[in-house]
């Protein structure tokens, strides 16, 4: 399992460490989740050839994974702090159902999958404290999420492997874009 934020293995031990600021906590939290995703991707790629597959588009049609676009205000051109923060939080909330799907998809990295899921919940809480306009954040409908989860779990083995790969890849992309955007705030 990855080292929890605040005990980052990259840190040099400091005798009197300052408490982390809000921005630093968020940055570390995202890096921590990204490290977890890297470990999960390793298992996925070692277990199947999904990481080299050219048939991603087939599976991608079944998924509606959050993506950053220029209109979301998170890119440097047209950057808008409030719009972007709403997009990041909304996107993370939308990813939660997909992270739930990942929970039974790993053998040797089961703990890691749980750590990614729980750390994402903590990240959402950090970001919600930072957001001024919480009304603009739409929470996914639990009934819709439940039926999506059932649908994903009913796929054949190949599609399930591909779905796992795509979720990890998309979540990594989303977090990387979020990390850059949050550094501008």
């Amino acid at each position: 399992a990855p080292v929890p934020p605040g005990e980052d293995s990259k840190d040099v031990a400091a005798p009197h460490r300052q408490p982390l600021t809000s921005s630093e906590r968020i940055d570390k939290q995202i890096r921590y989740i990204l490290d977890g995703i890297s470990a999960l991707r390793k298992e996925t790629c070692n277990k199947s050839n999904m990481c080299e597959s050219s048939k991603e588009a087939l599976a991608e049609n079944n998924l509606n994974l959050p993506k950053m676009a220029e209109k979301d205000g998170c890119f440097q051109s047209g950057f808008n702090e409030e719009t972007c923060l709403v997009k990041i939080i909304t996107g993370l909330l939308e990813f939660e159902v997909y992270l739930e799907y990942l929970q039974n998809r790993f053998e040797s990295s089961e703990e890691q999958a749980r750590a990614v899921q729980m750390s994402t919940k903590v990240l959402i809480q950090f970001l919600q404290k930072k957001a001024k306009n919480l009304d603009a954040i739409t929470t996914p409908d639990p009934t819709t999420n439940a039926s999506l989860l059932t649908k994903l779990q009913a796929q054949n083995q190949w599609l399930q492997d591909m779905t796992t790969h795509l979720i990890l890849r998309s979540f990594k992309e989303f977090l990387q874009s979020s990390l850059r955007a949050l550094r501008q705030m």
């Epitope: 040099v12 921005s23 995202i30 990204l34 950053m68 992309e173 990387q176």
Partner: antibody
Framework: QVTLRESGPALVRPTQTLTLTCTFS??????????VGWIRQPPGEALEWLAH???????YYNPALKGRLAVSKDTSKNQVVLSMNTVGPGDTATYYC????????????WGQGILVTVSS | DIQMTQSPSSLSASVGDRVTITCRAS??????LAWYQQKPGKAPKLLIY???YLADGVPSRFSGSGSGTDYTFTISSLQPEDIATYYC????????FGQGTKVEIK
């Protein structure tokens, strides 16, 4: 193995537009987290970061030069192009392109550089 | 925009000496800092990333430390092949380089 190579004119006239191409191999700019950046170094001076472009077409520019710079990518050709308009003698420098990978964001592979002189 | 102040601008030390270079950011950059080595006529080479991580193939005599706004680069035992200019660079927003430190042998 990762390689990057800069190409373009060695001499540019003042007020013209300088266009430089970075051709790379060993990685793809369609891979999430991948970035190619441009850095320059006037003779005997320090490194100056100019711009970089991410795999998803997000672009960052040096604020001091933002109005004069444009960066674009051609993923199929493994190329990134930097354009700088209205050049002057102060733009004489060695121009480097470099790769950044993933969220640790350090330039881990560099081209050998191309010396561009701005003179009439 | 965040400014990087690197010091000293140059230093002279003997082979085997411990060499320290510092880089100060105008605001917290949360350990998003890299150190590079550049030899005359060559492209820079990455030595340290994320403030403390040694890049692949870099000798262990090089190290980085620091957090917040203050960062340090250390060569534990200076070797003749370490003669070069060293730069820091941050990655919090738009990433400028420090002004560089030229390391020479006495």
């Amino acid at each position: 193995q990762v390689t990057l190579r800069e190409s373009g004119p060695a001499l540019v006239r003042p007020t013209q537009t300088l266009t430089l191409t970075c051709t790379f191999s060993g990685f793809s700019l369609s891979t999430s987290g991948m970035t190619v950046g441009w850095i320059r170094q006037p003779p005997g001076e320090a490194l100056e970061w100019l711009a970089h472009i991410w795999w998803n077409d997000d672009k960052y520019y040096n604020p001091a030069l933002k109005g004069r710079l444009a960066v674009s990518k051609d993923t199929s050709k493994n190329q990134v192009v930097l354009s700088m308009n209205t050049v002057g003698p102060g733009d004489t420098a060695t121009y480097y392109c470099a790769r950044m990978e993933d969220y640790d964001e350090a330039m881990d592979y560099w081209g050998q550089g191309i010396l561009v002189t701005v003179s009439s | 925009d965040i400014q990087m102040t690197q010091s000293p601008s140059s230093l002279s030390a003997s082979v085997g000496d411990r060499v320290t270079i510092t880089c100060r950011a105008s605001e917290n950059i949360y350990s998003n800092l890299a150190w590079y080595q550049q030899k005359p006529g060559k492209a820079p080479k990455l030595l340290i990333y994320a403030a403390t991580y040694l890049a692949d193939g870099v000798p262990s005599r090089f190290s980085g430390s620091g957090s917040g706004t203050d960062y340090t680069f250390t060569i534990s035992s200076l070797q003749p092949e370490d003669i070069a200019t060293y730069y820091c660079q941050h990655f919090w927003g738009t990433p400028p380089f420090g002004q560089g430190t030229k390391v020479e042998i006495k």
